[in-house]
Interface confidence: medium
């Protein structure tokens, strides 16, 4: 056991938040400020991420962690751990490289991120148009044509598409 | 390390003109889009224009077409924005950022970005 313990590499006993320092015989010496190591037995620290710019510091960075960012107000992270920072757009528009565009007719987008996409096609599912589409939102389709004839059972319209304070006809 | 560097900021008078440079590090700035943003005081960022990598592609935000060029020298690693007829609502931190397209169809995200550049406009 002792002579297996001699041949470990000395730099395996360093933890996380210092570095094995072959300048100075191998001893664990902590991590310089501005730079972190999340694993033992590494013989560097890495530098820690900078928030700057667009993106702001979520978490500090830590001699054991790095430091995380986010993108402030008026964009949102893509990537992996926000490596990047994306405009948001209004509701009813999409991001193009001439900037925010509204949604062209027969589009919409709900959201402030992401592409405006087509109106839901009722006819398809042999459904009707209750509820009109606009920039953004979809259309909401409504029971078929047939079902809507005179003798048909009358079919009560989903709830989302009633508006406040009128009752279905 | 990956590095922007901007500078050419400063005081002018309503009607007049700057040239704001970025110095480009660190990566093969030829191969991105680069992206001029700016920040007014108390606002949001507001993208300004965008170029794409041979400068053969340009977009301006409305308020400034016409007035402000954007340009590149892939050869010096230098994103410039030539501002002309400057108003009083220029007034603003500059900011220059690497990206703008080309992270797929709908990705318009931007990676790294300097820090900035004041421009008053100010008679």
């Known amino acids: 056991f002792e002579r297996t313990r001699s041949l470990q590499d000395p730099c395996s006993n360093c933890p996380a938040g210092t570095f094995c320092d072959n300048n100075r015989n191998q001893i664990c010496s902590p991590c310089p400020p501005n730079s972190f190591s999340s694993a033992g037995g590494q013989r560097t620290c890495d530098i820690c991420r900078q928030c700057k710019g667009v993106f702001r510091t979520r978490k500090e960075c830590s001699s054991t962690s790095n430091a995380e960012c986010d993108c402030t107000p008026g964009f949102h992270c893509l990537g992996a751990g926000c490596s990047m920072c994306e405009q948001d757009c209004k509701q009813g528009q999409e991001l193009t490289k001439k900037g925010c565009k509204d949604c062209c007719f027969g589009t919409f987008n709900d959201q402030k991120r992401g592409i405006c996409r087509p109106w839901t096609n009722c006819s398809l599912d042999g459904k009707s148009v209750l509820v009109n589409g606009t920039k953004e939102r979809d259309v909401v389709c409504g029971p078929s044509p047939a079902d809507l004839s005179p003798g048909a059972s009358s079919v009560t319209p989903p709830a989302p598409a009633r508006e406040p304070g009128h009752s279905p006809q | 390390e990956v590095q922007l560097v901007e500078s050419g900021g400063g005081l002018v008078q309503p009607g007049g003109s700057l040239r704001l440079s970025c110095a480009a590090s660190?990566?093969?700035?030829?191969?991105?889009?680069m992206t001029w943003f700016r920040q007014a005081p108390g606002r949001g960022l507001e993208w300004v224009a965008n170029i794409n990598q041979d400068g053969s592609e340009k977009y301006y935000v409305d308020s400034v077409e016409g007035r402000f060029t954007v340009s590149r020298d892939n050869a010096k690693n230098s994103l410039y924005l030539q501002m002309n007829s400057l108003r009083a609502e220029d007034t603003a931190v500059y900011y220059c950022?690497?990206?703008?397209?080309?992270?797929?169809?709908?990705?318009?995200?931007?990676?790294?970005w300097g820090q900035g550049t004041t421009v008053t406009v100010s008679s």
């Open positions: 950022a690497r990206g703008g397209l080309g992270y797929g169809d709908s990705h318009y995200g931007m990676d790294v």
């Open positions: 660190g990566f093969t700035f030829s191969s991105y889009w």
